[in-house]
Interface confidence: low
Amino acid sequence: DVERTTCPPEKEVHEIDESLIFYKKRELEACVDAALLAAQMDRVDAIPFTYEQLDVLKHKLDELYPQGYPESVIRHLGHLFLKMSPEDIRKWNVTSLETLKALLKVSKGHEMSAQVATLIDRVVVGRGQLDKDTVDTLTAFCPGCLCSLSPERLSSVPPSVIGAVRPQDLDTCGPRQLDVLYPKARLAFQNMSGSEYFVKIRPFLGGAPTEDVKALSQQNVSMDLATFMKLRREAVLPLTVAEVQKLLGPHVEGLKVEEQHSPVRDWILKQRQDDLDTLGLGLQGGIPNGYLILDLSVREALS
């Protein structure tokens, strides 16, 4: 239990050093002055404290800073960062990328995705926007962390920064995040030639609308199946068989492998079977020949 007791005179702490590893939890609680700890935080990480002892040190800092730690303390948390909860981190105001780098390094190899996501969020809030330096730091020290940001936070990315984002940084992004990033990427890469443009825009295509996917089908891009499978279902469903064939080029035969998976499965169900047959892939499940297709949504709108 962490309780407040009186510090024995011989145990009084005048500096944070290795002698503290021999202190019991109660002695640390009683003898370590929180202000001294905060002033000498840079020493803590070099001392092999137990997790129990780190708990006490955390309580000390929480006591001193009930509204959240100052950045001078946060920067030197070291392994004490592993003790922080998202609720703790939410109280911080972080503006320094050196602080971000230091804590990202500490978190490596630990299950701290929620804490890291909250930390990155606080950095974006502290700096006012997701600028190029922040994106560079994230891509260098935490691949995939960009996708831990909410769509609202990602909306603060200026298009000029998009070029610093690598394909692997977007691997874990969901549709709502790509919906935000795709228009920025389109703007960022708009002056590039067709083939160069496709290479750059490809990782962001999970946020592309139907009309942009249709446009790509006219440009001999030979989209790979992995990218096609990440397209929004709503963007794929209106495509014709001819458009998909043009879009995928030689990769079209991959549709057979993905026949049972969305969005391919859903797209097949909306195509005429005789159109699907023209692909020569044996895709089944299209609308049988001779059937009349009624668009009920239109009929309902008219009635």
Epitope: D1, H59, D62, E63, Y65, P66, Q67, G68, E87
Partner: antibody, heavy 120, light 107 residues
Framework: QVQLQQPGTELVKPGASVKLSCKAS????????MHWVKQRPGQGLEWIGN????????NNNENFKSKATLTVDTSSSTAYMQLSSLTSEDSAVYYC?????????????WGTGTTVTVSS | DIVMTQSQKFMSTSVGDRVSVTCKAS??????VAWYQQQPGQSPKALIY???YRYSGVPDRFTGSVSGTDFTLTISNVQSEDLAEYFC?????????FGGGTKLEIK
Amino acid sequence: QVQLQQPGTELVKPGASVKLSCKASGYTFTSYWMHWVKQRPGQGLEWIGNINPSNGGTNNNENFKSKATLTVDTSSSTAYMQLSSLTSEDSAVYYCVRNGYHGYWYFDVWGTGTTVTVSS
Amino acid sequence: DIVMTQSQKFMSTSVGDRVSVTCKASQNVGTNVAWYQQQPGQSPKALIYSASYRYSGVPDRFTGSVSGTDFTLTISNVQSEDLAEYFCQQYNSYPLTFGGGTKLEIK
């Protein structure tokens, strides 16, 4: 020692407002958030909201947003809660409570409580 | 809002016995739970925070524990002054919420 002193009772008429006070002593007033909690007989405890005495920032329970206004006077180390448009539902004991010592939102010191009776 | 359920409104025990007061959170709150004791006619008093840390000055017969979203306050060697109502409270997220309370009666 740490104390939160509140007046014992307040008798108010329906529709009126009342401003409850909570005088803190024995600690640095601006270093700890102050919360307010309502207790009606047989109905447990309800968190109303909290205020950061160092900058006046508040968080309110949605259920009390239009009912309670929290303020502080740092010169006298006093927290206030104004309750408006009072009805019989507002008859209760109101406690001011100090935030836990290590920064989480639990309550380590409770005030003496003010019994508010709304009656014509 | 997170609902904290104390299913037993009343519990009866004898001096010297061991009794457990339980509280269940409607969703994950980690260890962000506190326990309070309210003796008749008094203000509540802090007993436990962070699910299992005893507050300064609280007798060690009071212990807190957690298993998932189930929180338990155990009083071993119950004393007559333990006659009181006990409340749990979550401080994991706003709004902060309390359990409905469990009244401990001494036979």
